[in-house]
């Protein structure tokens, strides 16, 4: 049995999570993730899942409790969706800690919008009527 | 030129973001994206980029001098990033809004985690002692 | 109230070109998609292109590519599908269909307002 | 090849309930929305289930729109049949890149 299994079965105990009406209402992750089948686009999906489950474990960092099962099963994530590579972690970790209110960060994230926005799509390295050419090329491919 | 680079130039104005001292103290978001070429890599890393520009925009979306700017990269980013997919952009939409201090949304969290861990790598639909193999493949093959 | 008015449909000759119309109201026009779809005559529903609003990009019917262009014109509430080397099995009634305003993740549903068409004739 | 397979045709008495399924051929039914249109002669298409599940307004309840991953597939469910009903229904949803793609049709005979 993988080790963040016991940990995560001691996360419920303590948050109550194993109550029957925790159900109610639907998934907050499953469903979504059972809706995309293709690598990049779960990739997409997890990025935010696993950034939503550090904040939670960063609130309750202090708690003795679940510390032992926090840390763990976060060494298991670094395991499995950062491939063990801390500079993957790193780069997510900073990406996760910017404050969008922040007047500098606001500024440089601008600064940065057109080559950002040019690197979101393969096909947006190229001039526009091409690319309305590949957009159609990568959507019969699909 | 793209739609989008005359709409962020005016946002660059609106922020002033085209003066020289934004670039100090290093970019927030394309040295990161320069450090991963694989896909899925980048999405992980372009999923964090895309929602926060998406709260960026959101907590401006009422001034009248950037809107049809804010517009414009928004229609952008959902045609490039989510191929112009509602449902792509639905789901990424509803995982960035959960709030991580609700307590019912943190008791779902918990109750979901060990499917959600179980799903983090294509590995780990495998037996373990062959996961555990092609972990180490694929680090060191990274 | 949202609505679509086509134009500019006809009897053509096999080999000729044809632009149809598509003049929107109600609603603001460009932060929408605008899908051109076709019917042939006892037929079911064939898409045939998309342009986006603001960004204006093109999308086709891998079928129709190279063949047919769609454009637009926000400042007049139109967009435009220019038909080339038209042929036979072109003969359709040709809708234009409000999509998704993409910068909106509320947007109302794609494709919930159709026009009446405007039927195209391809014959010698 | 992406194709949406309909029925040709199917019937049902007033009052009954009666489904309407549209294949996805290729591609995960999950990873894209489905709209379903009801077509009557000389009229333009209209839509009676948007986004997989959720009706327009002027829609009765009567319509249900669901989406089964394990046979990729959606569904059309009409119950409580009425002789209005009678039409042609299209399913459409996409692929790729804002690539809009229509089942056949299914024509729809109250008896």
């Known amino acids: 049995q993988d080790p963040y299994v016991k940990e995560a079965e001691n996360l419920k105990k303590y948050f109550n999570a194993g109550d029957p009406d925790v159900a109610d209402n639907g998934t907050l992750f499953l469903d979504i993730l059972r809706n995309w089948k293709e690598e990049s686009d779960r990739k997409i999906m997890q990025s935010q899942i696993v950034s939503f489950y550090f904040k939670l474990f960063k609130n309750f960092k202090d708690d003795q409790r679940i510390q032992k099962s926090v840390e763990t099963i976060k060494e298991d994530i670094n395991v499995k969706f950062f491939n063990s590579n801390k500079k993957k972690r790193d780069d997510f970790e900073k990406l996760t800690n910017y404050s969008v209110t922040d007047s500098n960060v606001q500024r440089k994230a601008v600064h940065e919008l057109i080559q950002v926005m040019a690197e979101l799509s393969p096909a947006a390295k190229i001039g526009k009527r091409k690319r309305s050419q590949m957009f159609r090329g990568r959507r019969a491919s699909q | 030129q793209d739609p989008y680079v005359k709409e962020a130039e005016n946002l660059k104005k609106y922020f002033n973001a085209g003066d020289p001292d934004v670039a100090d103290n290093g970019t927030l978001f394309l040295d990161i994206l320069r450090n991963w070429k694989e896909e899925s890599d980048r999405k992980i890393m372009q999923s964090q980029i895309v929602s926060f520009y998406f709260k960026l925009f959101k907590n401006f979306k009422d001034d009248q001098r950037i809107q049809k700017s804010v517009e414009t990269i928004k229609e952008d980013i959902n045609v490039k990033f989510f191929n112009s997919n509602k449902k792509k952009r639905d789901d990424f939409e509803k995982l960035t809004n959960y709030s991580v201090t609700d307590s019912n949304v943190q008791r779902k969290a918990v109750h979901e985690l060990i499917q959600v861990m179980a799903e983090l790598s294509p590995a780990a639909k495998i037996g373990k002692r062959k996961r555990s193999q092609m972990f180490r493949g694929r680090r060191a093959s990274q | 109230e949202v609505q679509l008015v086509e134009s500019g449909g006809g009897l053509v000759k096999p080999g000729d070109s044809l632009t149809v119309s598509c003049v929107a109201s109600?609603?603001?026009?460009?932060?929408?998609?605008i899908h051109w779809v076709r019917q042939a005559p006892g037929k079911g529903l064939e898409w045939v292109a998309t342009?986006?609003?603001?960004?204006?990009?093109?999308f086709y019917s891998d079928s129709l590519r190279g063949r047919f262009t769609v454009s637009r014109d926000n400042a007049q509430n139109s967009v435009y599908l220019h038909m080339s080397s038209l042929r036979g099995e072109d003969t359709a009634l040709y809708y234009c269909?409000?999509?998704?305003?993409?910068?909106?993740?509320?947007?109302?549903?794609?494709?919930?307002?159709w026009g009446r068409g405007t039927l195209v004739t391809v014959s010698s | 090849n992406f194709m949406l397979t309909q029925p040709l045709s199917v019937s049902g008495y007033p009052g009954k309930t009666i489904v309407i399924s549209c294949v996805r051929s290729?591609?995960?039914?999950?990873?894209?929305?489905v709209q379903w249109f009801q077509q009557r002669p000389g009229s333009a298409p209209a839509m009676v289930i948007y986004?997989?599940?959720?009706?327009p307004s002027g829609i009765p309840d009567r319509f249900s729109g669901s989406v089964d991953a394990s046979s990729n597939s959606a569904s059309l469910t009409i119950s409580g049949l009425k002789t209005e009903d009678e039409a042609d229904y299209f399913c459409?949803?996409?692929?790729?890149?804002?690539?809009?793609?229509f089942g056949g049709g299914t024509k729809l005979t109250v008896l």
């Open positions: 459409q949803s996409y692929y790729g890149n804002n690539q809009v793609l």
């Open positions: 269909v409000r999509g998704y305003d993409h910068s909106d993740s509320n947007s109302a549903a794609d494709l919930l307002h």
């Open positions: 290729s591609g995960s039914v999950a990873s894209h929305y």
């Open positions: 986004e997989d599940s959720h009706r």
């Open positions: 109600g609603f603001t026009f460009s932060n929408y998609f």
């Open positions: 342009i986006s609003g603001r960004t204006k990009y093109m």
